[in-house]
Amino acid sequence: AFGISGVQKYTRALHDSSITGISPITEYLASLSTYNDQSITFALEDESYEIYVEDLKKDEKKDKVLLSYYESQHPSNESGDGVDGKMLMVTLSPTKDFWLHANNKEHSVELHKCEKPLPDQAFFVLHNMHSNCVSFECKTDPGVFIGVKDNHLALIKVDSSENLCTENILFKLSET
């Protein structure tokens, strides 16, 4: 894990803009784990950050991520019909100035250093799921979610016409 103490030093001043230049409605510092209780961890390797999905050893500290919640400012057409009310979007930052990004070309989830305003690739539609879980859908690619593949985070297409088991796109958020 890296630089996580830096997350604790975040202030609202660092998070005072979104796509439309407004503040997030709230923020939440949490550890991220899979439906099967594997931890999402972050490591610096060869001058770039890697994201892992792994079982932590007992008493090993979990990495924390700062979730910044935003209202979508207009009725969205994320669902393809343009009739939705407001939704919740989220950005995820495990350390100062770095955010999770959707790389739709490579179907990968990456950590990128960037300045405000954040690009659309850093925003995810937040889905409230049962079993105390959430899912993260790419703002830039409706129907594509952050998921787990081969002990890494990846982008996974969820097709409502297919009987997919979605445990691999379910995540738990925990303050501990």
Epitope: A30, L67, S79, D81, G85, N128, N163
Partner: antibody
Framework: EVQLVESGGGLVQPGGSLRLSCAAS????????MNWVRQAPGKGLEWMAE??????????HYAESVKGRFTISRDNSKNTVYLQMNSLRAEDTAVYYC????????????WGQGTLVTVSS | DIVMTQSPDSLAVSLGERATINCRAS??????????LNWYQQKPGQPPKLLIF???SQGSGVPDRFSGSGSGTDFTLTISSLQAEDVAVYYC?????????FGQGTKVEIK
């Protein structure tokens, strides 16, 4: 136009059964969790049942008061959600609203006009 | 089950004045750093309409005079300047846990 239209309400005797239907139009029905909410005459709102999506294995959830008596189901090919009500009691008398949760499942943002179910002998 | 209790049961407010409705949950409705608390307005003979979600975010097309606040167990809906068309019953609802539960409703009338 986004619309939910309920049907199937009416007068039924205690112990009887009724099947409510809700026809959805104007949106991609298969993308949304659907709910039933009821309101007894002159009373408040009571959430009844919910059904999720195919990729959630159509999981269903119920209020304790109707668990084992009511069954929610959906037919995406017909854009319709159903509520099968068995062993009806006088206290089930209410207007039954079909309702759609928003994309992301945070709140209900589309409601039908409701259908009245009266349980009486 | 989480029990939602609203106060007052009814409220008479002069046009242009502020109306405040309180909602208390029997346990915290917070999760993921958000409050799973919605407010709905219901006018006679109509289905409910969403006003506020996650405690303080306005629904689409909701006038700015409606605002929500609170977290944990205590929440407030405020109508900053009551209009004639705001006469209705207002319900809070928690969506943190199944069964989703509503408050008993608060009837708002013109004084």
């Amino acid at each position: 136009e986004v619309q939910l239209v309920e049907s199937g309400g009416g007068l039924v005797q205690p112990g009887g059964s009724l099947r409510l239907s809700c026809a959805a139009s104007g949106f991609t029905f298969s993308n949304y969790w659907m709910n039933w909410v009821r309101q007894a005459p002159g009373k408040g709102l009571e959430w009844m049942a919910e059904i999720t999506l195919k990729f959630n294995n159509y999981s269903t959830h119920y209020a304790e008061s109707v668990k084992g008596r009511f069954t929610i189901s959906r037919d995406n090919s017909k854009n319709t959600v159903y509520l099968q009500m068995n062993s009806l009691r006088a206290e089930d008398t209410a207007v039954y609203y079909c309702a759609r949760r928003n994309y992301g499942n945070w709140y209900i943002n589309v409601w039908g006009q409701g259908t009245l179910v009266t349980v009486s002998s | 089950d989480i029990v939602m209790t609203q106060s007052p049961d009814s409220l008479a407010v002069s046009l242009g004045e502020r109306a405040t409705i309180n909602c208390r949950a029997s346990e915290s409705v917070d999760k993921f750093g958000l409050s799973f608390l919605n407010w709905y307005q219901q006018k006679p003979g109509q289905p409910p309409k969403l006003l506020i979600f996650v405690a303080s975010s306005q629904g689409s097309g909701v006038p700015d005079r409606f605002s929500g606040s609170g977290s944990g167990t205590d929440f407030t809906l405020t109508i900053s300047s009551l209009q004639a068309e705001d006469v209705a019953v207002y319900y809070c609802q928690q969506s943190k846990d199944i069964p989703y539960t509503f408050g008993q409703g608060t009837k708002v009338e013109i004084k």
